[in-house]
Amino acid sequence: FNLSYPITPWRFKLSCMPPNSTYDYFLLPAGLSKNTSNLNGHYETAVEFNSSDTHFSNLSKTTFHCCFRSEQDRNCSLCADNIEGKTFVSTVNSSVFQQMGANWNIQCWLKGDLKLFICYVESLFKNPFKNYKHKVHLLYVLPEVLEDSPLVPQKGSFQMVHCNCSVHERCECLVPVPTAKLNDTLLMCLKITSGGVIFQSPLMSVQPINMVKPDPPLGLRMEITDDGNLKISWSSPPLVPFPLQYEVKYSENSTTVIREADKIVSATSLLVDGILPGSSYEVQVRGKRLDGPGIWSDWSTPHVFTTQDVIYFPPKILTSVGSNVSFHCIYKNENKIVSSKKIVWWMNLAEKIPQSQYDVVSDHVSKVTFFNLNETKPRGKFTYDAVYCCNEHECHHRYAELYVIDVNINISCETDGHLTKMTCRWSTNTIQSLAGSTLQLRYRRSSLYCFDIPSIHPISKPKDCYLQSDGFYECVFQPIFLLSGYTMWIRINHPLGSLDSPPTCVLPDSVVKPLPPSSVKAEIIKNIGLLKISWEKPVFPENNLQFQIRYGLSGKEIQWKMYDVYDAKSKSVSLPVPDFCAVYAVQVRCKRSDGLGLWSNWSNPAYTVVMDIKVPMRGPEFWRIINGDTMKKEKNVTLLWKPLMKNDSLCSVQRYVINHHTSCNGTWSEDVGNHTKFTFLWTEQAHTVTVLAINSIGASVANFNLTFSWPMSKVNIVQSLSAYPLNSSCVILSWILSPSDYKLMYFIIEWKNLNEDGEIKWLRISSSVKKYYIHDHFIPIEKYQFSLYPIFMEGVGKPKIINSFAQDNTEKHQNDEQKLISEEDLGGEQKLISEEDLHHHHHH
C-alpha cells in the first residue's frame, strides 16, 4: 500500500483542481505550505495547488481527483472504486474554482472507547463550493492480510458510510472498528459531492491504534498535602489500552500574586509548592498516548480550588495514644501573611499550648508538636481535639482536628479441644469508636514459635471476624499449625489513615482449651457418707492435666465449693459433705498441668441420687391428743408426729412403726405406713409407745418413748405458768416447778387460739428450761390457751393450762425484747422456732 497516503494524527488539507487531459493522473503542483499551527494547537499539512498554471473550460461530466501532498511522495493514488462514465452538470463558478481550487480540512481519530474511527470533513472558508449543499461518503476497507496484496484492493471490496453533514458545514464520518483490528491498517477514501461535482480523495491508510484520542481525564481534584503542597490529582479515562501522558495547565490567583503554568507529566498527579492562603487555583488536564503516536484529548472541565485564610497541614491527624504528631499552619490576616514568629497555638480554645512545642519552619510556616499523646476524650458530639493556629491573641474560626485513639485492643485466643481450629476474640468496647472507621484483624504466621517481642510485619493477611451478640468479634483460624506463632493485631482503617493495635503473638499449642472431662459420675458412698466423684480425661491434649471439681447442693442458685486435683493420673476423688441426703450437682474441668492453655468448659453436671445410706438417726418426736371422757378408764389416744427430716432419716422414711408395751399384753408392733397420725385405745394403767422410722436399710435406733400412765397423769409439778405477749409474733412462756422424785425428761408446750377453729400447736423442749419464747402469730386481745406438760420417764404428768396472758409485768416483758436474754435466763436454752417449723407440730 505504498500508493496510499498515511494519515497523520493532526489535521490535514485535501485540495482539488481541474484535471489536465494530457495526463492519466493530473500533475501535482510544486508548492507545499510549511506545517503551521492553527489556533487550537493542532498541526495541519496544507496541500495547495497553484491554479494559475492550469486552464480548463468545462467542469461538467467530471470527477475531480484530489490530492494530499508530502515531500517524500509526489504521486496520487486513486481510490479503487473510482466512478467512471457518469456525467455531472456543474453549476459552479469556474473562474473561482480556476483561481482557488476546492479545499477541505480533514481530521481523523479513534474515539476513546476504541470502537469508532471518526473523520471530520470541514469546508475551508475560501471554498467556492462552500455555499453548496454537499454530500460526503467515506469508503473503507480493513484487508485481512496486508502483505499478500501489494496492489490497491479491488473495486467492490470497499464499504461505504454516509457522513452526517448536519452541523456547521462539518461532516462526521463514523467507521466501526472491531477491537481485534485496532492494530490493522484501515484503507479509506472520501467522496464529496458538491455543486454537482464529485471530488474524490486519494487512498488513505491508517492504523487506528495510532490515532486514539482519549476521553478527557476524570475526577480532577485538589487537596493540600500533609507537607503543605497543593496536590492536583485525576484519574485516567477508562478503556485506554496504553499509558498516557498528561498536560496540566493551572493558574494561581491571590491578592499578592498571579501565576500560570503548564506542565506535562506521566503520573496522575502533580504537586504544586508554595501554596498560599486565601488563593484561588484553576486547573485543567488533558491526556495523550505516552509512548507512541496519538491525539491529545479535549481539556477536562476547569476545576477551581480556593485555599482558606488559615491553612493547616495536615488538616486532620489520626494517631494512637503515646505518639508524637505535628501540625503546620500558614495564617493570612487582612491580605497579609502573618509571620510564623507571631503565631500562637491553642487547644480547644481552652488551653494555650506551651511555646516550647512550637517550631518556626519558615517565615510564614509555624509548626506545633504534641508529645506522648493521651486519648481524646469526646466532648459532646465532638470526637476530636480542635487545634487552633492564632495570630497572637486573635484566633480564626478554622481549626485542625486531632484524633487520638487508644488502640490497645486485647486479642485472646483459644484452640479447641480437637486441636483443629483456633478462635480469637476481641472487643472494641475499650476504644473510642470513630465514625467512618473499619476494623480488621491482620496476622502473620511464622513457621515455628513466637519471637520474644512481636512486631508488625509489612506483609500480613486479613482475617474475617464476625460480631457476636456479646459485643466481641470472633475470628476462626482453620486449619492451624499448632507450633506456628500467629502474630496478630487490629488495624483501624479510616479516611485519615490507619492505626495498628500493639501486636500479640499466639502459639495455638499454648492456648488449648481442652474438651471437658467425660463420664462424670457422682454418688454418696453408703455407710461412709462421702461424695465420690469420678471422670475420664479428654483425649486431647496429650499433656498432663490438672482437674478442678465444683460441687454444691442442687438448686436454682448453686453455692459451689471448689476442689483441685493436681495428680494427672487421678480419675476419682471422695469428698466429705455436710448433708448426705441432699442432691449434689458436680462438674469437672481440666487444664494443662504446665500452666499453659485454658481451663476447659465445665463438664455437664452429674447429680447424686438420694439413697438411704444409713438407718435413720432417730425416730420422730411425737405427741398425743386424748379424746374421750377424762374420767373413763378407756381413752382414744391419737399420736401426732412430724415427718422425719432427711438429715435424720438418712435419707428417707418408707414407713413408721409403732411399738407398744403394756404390762398385760407385753410388746407388739403396728405398721402405720407413711402416715404421721395414729390412734389407739389406751385401756391399761400404763401404756408405752415408741415411734420408729424405717428406711431401706433398717429401723431407727434412737427413738422417743411416751408412757401414758393413769397415776402419772395426776403428778403435778408445774406450780405456775404465765404467758407474756412481747409483740404479735412472740410470746414468752415462763413457769415455776415444785420438786419431784420423778425423772423429768422434757416438756411439751401446747397452744391454741380459742377464737379460731385452728389447730393445736406443740413443741418439745428441754427439761432444764424455765422460760421459753414461742414464735408464732399472736393477736394479744384474742383468747389463747397455753399448756405445759411435764414428761417423766414414768409417764406424762399433769399439765398446767392457762387461758390468758399475764396481766402484770406485760410492759416489763415487752422491754425485755430489747435486751439480750442470757443462757441463764433461758435455763440453758433459748429455742427460736419459725412458723414453718411449727407447722409440723400442728394438729388440725
Epitope: 405477749p725 377464737n755 379460731e756 402469730h777 384474742e782 387461758n803 396472758f805 399475764a806
Partner: antibody, heavy 117, light 108 residues
Framework: EVQLVESGGSVVRPGESLRLSCAAS????????MSWVRQAPGKGLEWVSG????????VYADSVKGRFTVSRDNAKNSLYLQMNSLRAEDTALYHC??????????WGQGTLVTVSS | DIQMTQSPSSLSASVGDRVTITCRAS??????LNWYQQKPGKAPKLLIY???SLQSGVPSRFSGSGSGTDFTLTISSLQPEDFATYYC??????????FGQGTRLEIK
C-alpha cells in the same frame, strides 16, 4: 344471733369527756376480746382500742393513747370506752366489734360522737 | 406501723361484671389480711379472713387471694347488693390494726 349495740354518743365540747357503752348478746361474751373502731364522717375505718377476753390486756391507737380507756364487765356482757380530753378530730361514729381473726367478725351499728365548740 | 393501700379508690361496674380490688401492704404481712364490706349507714361486715378464707354466710362469688404484700378481692359476678365500700385490714403486726383507705364500688 350475735348482736352489738353501742350507746353514749352525743355532742360535746373539746376537752370534755364521754363514756360509750356496748351491750353484747348472742355469744359467750367472756370468750372473746373486743375492739372499738371509729369512722369519721365520709372517711374510712380507724381502729381505736382493744381489750382481751378477761380485760387483762388493753391496747390503743397512738392517736388516743393516754386519753381513752377501754374496759369490760363480763358479768354484764358490756364493753366501755371512757373518752377524756376530747378533740374535734375525735368526731366519728364509734363501733364496737368482736375480735376474731386479728380483726372483727361482728360489728355494732355505731354511736355518733361529735366534738364541737 | 404497716400502711395499707387500696386501688382503685373507686370504680364503676355493672351487674354481672367481674370486679377486682387490690390491696398492697407496706411490708410483708404473710396471709394476715381481712376484707370487709360496708354499705352506707351500716356497720362493716367481714367477708374474707386470712387472705382467702370465706367467712360463713358470705356468698361464694366473693374470693380473696395473695400473700406477702399484694392481695386481691374478687367478686366474680356483681350483684345489685354488692355495691358498697370495701376495706382491707392487716392483722400481722398488732397493735395497731390498720385498714386500707377503702374502695367505693358504684353502679355504672
Amino acid at each position: 344471733e350475735v348482736q352489738l349495740v353501742e350507746s353514749g354518743g352525743s355532742v360535746v365540747r373539746p376537752g370534755e369527756s364521754l363514756r360509750l357503752s356496748c351491750a353484747a348478746s348472742g355469744f359467750t361474751f367472756d370468750d372473746y376480746g373486743m375492739s372499738w373502731v371509729r369512722q369519721a364522717p365520709g372517711k374510712g375505718l380507724e381502729w381505736v382500742s382493744g381489750i382481751s377476753w378477761n380485760g387483762g390486756i388493753t391496747v390503743y391507737a397512738d392517736s388516743v393513747k393516754g386519753r381513752f380507756t377501754v374496759s369490760r364487765d363480763n358479768a354484764k356482757n358490756s364493753l366501755y370506752l371512757q373518752m377524756n380530753s376530747l378533740r374535734a378530730e375525735d368526731t366519728a361514729l364509734y363501733h364496737c366489734a368482736r375480735a376474731r381473726y386479728g380483726g372483727a367478725d361482728y360489728w355494732g351499728q355505731g354511736t355518733l360522737v361529735t366534738v364541737s365548740s | 406501723d404497716i400502711q395499707m393501700t387500696q386501688s382503685p379508690s373507686s370504680l364503676s361496674a355493672s351487674v354481672g361484671d367481674r370486679v377486682t380490688i387490690t390491696c398492697r401492704a407496706s411490708q410483708s404481712i404473710s396471709s394476715y389480711l381481712n376484707w370487709y364490706q360496708q354499705k352506707p349507714g351500716k356497720a362493716p361486715k367481714l367477708l374474707i379472713y386470712a387472705a382467702s378464707s370465706l367467712q360463713s354466710g358470705v356468698p361464694s362469688r366473693f374470693s380473696g387471694s395473695g400473700s406477702g404484700t399484694d392481695f386481691t378481692l374478687t367478686i366474680s359476678s356483681l350483684q345489685p347488693e354488692d355495691f358498697a365500700t370495701y376495706y382491707c385490714q392487716q392483722s400481722y403486726s398488732t397493735p395497731p390494726i390498720t385498714f386500707g383507705q377503702g374502695t367505693r364500688l358504684e353502679i355504672k
